[in-house]
C-alpha cells in the first residue's frame, strides 16, 4: 500500500480467483484514543472500533472511503483504491491501446519544435468518474524538471456503438536546450483513477523522436509564362524552431489528381520553392520534415492547381 | 579545416559530408537485421557515448562566439563512433551484408573527422566503452542502439555545419 496523495491510498493486488489479497491497517488521524468507530462509504454499518482498523482487501467491494467517527463526528477519511496485477502485468483497463506506432501504446506525444514543449494525448471509452494526473521529468534517476498542465477532454468521437474520449495535456521542459543532443529521455507518467480503480501509464521518448512540424505556410502558385509549369513557393511554419539556417527543414511537394488512383508526382527539396507541372483538376501539396533527423512529416498544406 | 589554434573549417565541405552522414545513418539503421528486441531497456548504451551537450557551444550563439569548443566536441564524437563501427560489435556475428551502408558510414565518419583535424594536430579523444556483447543477439541490439544514437549526434553536427556554412563562412 502506498499514498497517492493526502488521504488517498493505493493497494496493489495480485488479481486471480481466490487470491489472498492484502492486509491493510488504517489509522484514524486523531489524538482521540477511545470511542472510535469505522464505516465504509455511505454505509452506516460499523466495521470495527478503535484507533486502527485491520482489513483484508481482496476485491473492489473492499475498496472505497473508510471513515473514522467519534460520537457522530467525522475524525478522518482514508480512500482506498485498487491497482490490479494479473499474471505479473499491471492492468490497463482505463485507457485504449492506440496500437501506433506499436502495440501497448496508451500515451502518444508530439512536439512542433525543439523548444521543449510537447503535447500528449490518450483515449478512453469511459465518460464518468474519471480523473487523470500527469507528471513528467527529463531522466528518471536524477530527474530534471518538466512542468505539465492539467489534462483536459480535447475531443469526443463516435466509433461504431461506442463513444471515444480523447484527453490531452501540454508540458514544457523547464530548462530546455533546443540545440543540444538529448542524452536522457523525457518520462511522462499518467495516473488514471476510474471509480475505485487506479492505473498508471508511462511513456519515455526523446523530443527529437516526437517532432512533427506544422504544415508549411503561405503556399502559393506562380504560373510560368508559356508553360504548363508552375512555381510553388511556401514558408517555414511559424511554430518551427529558429534560426532556420540551423533548424532546417526538408520538403516534399506532391501533385495529386482528383482521383486517388492517379499517379502522384513527388519532388523532394530543401528549398522553399519548386517547379512542377500542374495538371487540370489536380492539387499541389507540400509537407515538411526535419532535414537532418527523420521524425514525422507534417500534415500536408494544399492548394488547387486551377 | 578546424585547426586547434582557431582557424575556420571548410564549412561548406563539412556541411555536405555531415548531411551525407545523416542520410547514411538512417539508411544503415533498418538494414542491420530484423529487430523487435524491444528497446525499453532501463539501462541505455548511449550513456557511454559522447553527446553534444548544452554547454558545448554548438548552439547558434555559441558558434558565433567561438566555434572551436563545438568543433572539438564533434570531432571527439566522430572518432568515437568511427571506432565503434570498426569494432567487433559491427564486424562480429551476425555478419553485415557486403553492400551494407555501415561501411560507407564508417568511411564518412573518418572523412569528416579528418576535415576537422588535419594530421599533426591532436584533440583529446574518448575511450570507447567496453559494451562486451558475447551473443549475436546482443551485438544486434547494440548495433541498433549505436546507430540510433549516431543519428542524433550527426543531426546536431549537420545543423552546426549548415548554420556555419550559411553564417560563418568567409
Amino acid at each position: 500500500i502506498w499514498e497517492l496523495k493526502k488521504d488517498v491510498y493505493v493497494v496493489e493486488l495480485d488479481w486471480y480467483p481466490d487470491a489472498p489479497g492484502e492486509m491493510v491497517v488504517l489509522t484514524c488521524d486523531t489524538p482521540e484514543e477511545d470511542g472510535i468507530t469505522w464505516t465504509l462509504d455511505q454505509s452506516s454499518e460499523v466495521l470495527g472500533s478503535g484507533k486502527t482498523l485491520t482489513i483484508q482487501v481482496k476485491e473492489f467491494g473492499d475498496a472505497g472511503q473508510y471513515t473514522c467517527h467519534k460520537g457522530g463526528e467525522v475524525l478522518s477519511h482514508s480512500l482506498l483504491l485498487l491497482h490490479k496485477k494479473e499474471d505479473g502485468i499491471w492492468s490497463t483497463d482505463i485507457l485504449k491501446d492506440q496500437k501506433e506506432p506499436k502495440n501497448k501504446t496508451f500515451l502518444r506525444c508530439e512536439a512542433k519544435n525543439y523548444s521543449g514543449r510537447f503535447t500528449c494525448w490518450w483515449l478512453t471509452t469511459i465518460s464518468t468518474d474519471l480523473t487523470f494526473s500527469v507528471k513528467s521529468s527529463r531522466g528518471s534517476s536524477d530527474p530534471q524538471g518538466v512542468t505539465c498542465g492539467a489534462a483536459t477532454l480535447s475531443a469526443e468521437r463516435v466509433r461504431g456503438d461506442n463513444k471515444e474520449y480523447e484527453y490531452s495535456v501540454e508540458c514544457q521542459e523547464d530548462s530546455a536546450c533546443p540545440a543540444a543532443e538529448e542524452s536522457l529521455p523525457i518520462e511522462v507518467m499518467v495516473d488514471a483513477v476510474h471509480k475505485l480503480k487506479y492505473e498508471n501509464y508511462t511513456s519515455s521518448f526523446f523530443i527529437r523522436d516526437i517532432i512533427k512540424p506544422d504544415p508549411p505556410k503561405n503556399l502559393q502558385l506562380k504560373p510560368l509564362k508559356n508553360s504548363r509549369q508552375v512555381e510553388v513557393s511556401w514558408e517555414y511554419p511559424d511554430t518551427w524552431s529558429t534560426p532556420h539556417s540551423y533548424f532546417s527543414l526538408t520538403f516534399c511537394v506532391q501533385v495529386q489528381g482528383k482521383s486517388k488512383r492517379e499517379k502522384k508526382d513527388r519532388v523532394f527539396t530543401d528549398k522553399t520553392s519548386a517547379t512542377v507541372i500542374c495538371r487540370k483538376n489536380a492539387s499541389i501539396s507540400v509537407r515538411a520534415q526535419d532535414r537532418y533527423y527523420s521524425s514525422s512529416w507534417s500534415e500536408w498544406a494544399s492548394v488547387p492547381c486551377s | 579545416r578546424a585547426v586547434p589554434g582557431g582557424s575556420s573549417p571548410a564549412w561548406t565541405q563539412c556541411q555536405q559530408l555531415s548531411q551525407k552522414l545523416c542520410t547514411l545513418a538512417w539508411s544503415a539503421h533498418p538494414l542491420v537485421g530484423h529487430m523487435d528486441l524491444r528497446e525499453e531497456g532501463d539501462e541505455e548504451t548511449t550513456n557511454d557515448v559522447p553527446h553534444i551537450q548544452c554547454g558545448d557551444g554548438c548552439d547558434p550563439q555559441g558558434l558565433r562566439d567561438n566555434s572551436q569548443f563545438c568543433l572539438q566536441r564533434i570531432h571527439q564524437g566522430l572518432i568515437f563512433y568511427e571506432k565503434l563501427l570498426g569494432s567487433d560489435i559491427f564486424t562480429g556475428e551476425p555478419s553485415l551484408l557486403p553492400d551494407s551502408p555501415v561501411g560507407q558510414l564508417h568511411a564518412s565518419l573518418l572523412g569528416l573527422s579528418q576535415l576537422l583535424q588535419p594530421e599533426g594536430h591532436h584533440w583529446e579523444t574518448q575511450q570507447i566503452p567496453s559494451l562486451s556483447p558475447s551473443q549475436p543477439w546482443q551485438r544486434l541490439l547494440l548495433r541498433f542502439k549505436i546507430l540510433r544514437s549516431l543519428q542524433a549526434f550527426v543531426a546536431v553536427a549537420a545543423r552546426v555545419f549548415a548554420h556555419g556554412a550559411a553564417t560563418l563562412s568567409p
Epitope: - | E40, T45, Q135, Q138
Partner: antibody
C-alpha cells in the same frame, strides 16, 4: 515447414568418437544458428555448443576439448563430433534451431525429435 | 557459468487452478534491459517446446493461459488455469552468456 532431424549411431563404445548429423529443411543455415543439446535419461537439459550463421562456433567449456561442430550450408547439414565417449555421455541428443537473433535473444524455437545414444561396451 | 535454480521441483495443482513456477539465475540475465530468459515445456518422450521467450513474450500457437514475468535474476512462469494437457516438465533457460544453461526442471501434475 521447419524440420530438424538427427541421425547417427544408437550405440557407441567407450573411448570411441560419436558423429551425429542434423539435416534441416524449411530454412537456411546461413540465416539461423544451430545448437546441440543433450538430456541424460530422467535428467535436465545441457547445452553443448552452437554454430552461428557465419560458421563461427561456441562450445560448453566443460566438454570443449572433445567437441567439434561444423556445417555444410549447401547440404543443409550440421555435424556434431564428440571424441572419447564415456557411459556418462549416454543421453538423447537434440539438434535445435536458435530463433531469429533480433526477436528471440537466444531462445530455441524449433527442436529435432532427438536421437538416443547409449555409451556401453 | 550462470546457474539456474527452479522451484518447486514438482507441483500438484487442481484442474482450472493456477500454477506458478519460479526460476532464479545466479547473476543477471539482462543485457541493456532485454531479459534473455526463456521457458520450455517437455512432455514424456517428446523434445522440449518453446512457450515463452525474452521473459514475457508468448511464442505463437501457445495458449494465452501461459504467461511469463520477471527481470534480471528472478522470473516466473504462470499457468492461469491448469488443463490436463499441461502436465509436463517445465524448464527455464538463459542465453545471456555462454554456456547457455537450463534450470533443473519443475514437474507439473494434476492434484
Amino acid at each position: 515447414e521447419v524440420t530438424l532431424k538427427e541421425s547417427g549411431p544408437v550405440l557407441v563404445k567407450p573411448t570411441e568418437t560419436l558423429t551425429l548429423t542434423c539435416t534441416v529443411s524449411g530454412f537456411s543455415l546461413s540465416s539461423y544458428a544451430i545448437s546441440w543439446i543433450r538430456q541424460p535419461p530422467g535428467k535436465a537439459l545441457e547445452w553443448l555448443g552452437v554454430i552461428w550463421t557465419g560458421g563461427g562456433t561456441n562450445y560448453n567449456s566443460g566438454i570443449k576439448s572433445r567437441l567439434t561442430i561444423s556445417k555444410d550450408t549447401s547440404k543443409s547439414q550440421v555435424v556434431l563430433t564428440m571424441t572419447n565417449m564415456d557411459p556418462v555421455d549416454t543421453a538423447t541428443y537434440y539438434c535445435v534451431r536458435e530463433g531469429d537473433y533480433g526477436s528471440y535473444a537466444g531462445a530455441m524455437d524449433y527442436w529435432g525429435q532427438g536421437t538416443t545414444v547409449t555409451v556401453s561396451s | 557459468d550462470i546457474v539456474m535454480t527452479q522451484s518447486p521441483d514438482s507441483l500438484a495443482v487442481s484442474l482450472g487452478e493456477r500454477a506458478t513456477i519460479n526460476c532464479r539465475a545466479s547473476e543477471s540475465v539482462d543485457y541493456y534491459g532485454i531479459s534473455s530468459m526463456h521457458w520450455f515445456q517437455q512432455k514424456p518422450g517428446q523434445p522440449p517446446k518453446l512457450l515463452i521467450y525474452r521473459a514475457s513474450n508468448l511464442e505463437s500457437g501457445v495458449p494465452d493461459r501461459f504467461s511469463g514475468s520477471g527481470s534480471r535474476t528472478d522470473f516466473t512462469l504462470t499457468i492461469s488455469s491448469l488443463q490436463a494437457e499441461d502436465v509436463a516438465v517445465y524448464y527455464c533457460q538463459q542465453a545471456n552468456k555462454d554456456p547457455y544453461t537450463f534450470g533443473g526442471g519443475t514437474k507439473v501434475e494434476i492434484k
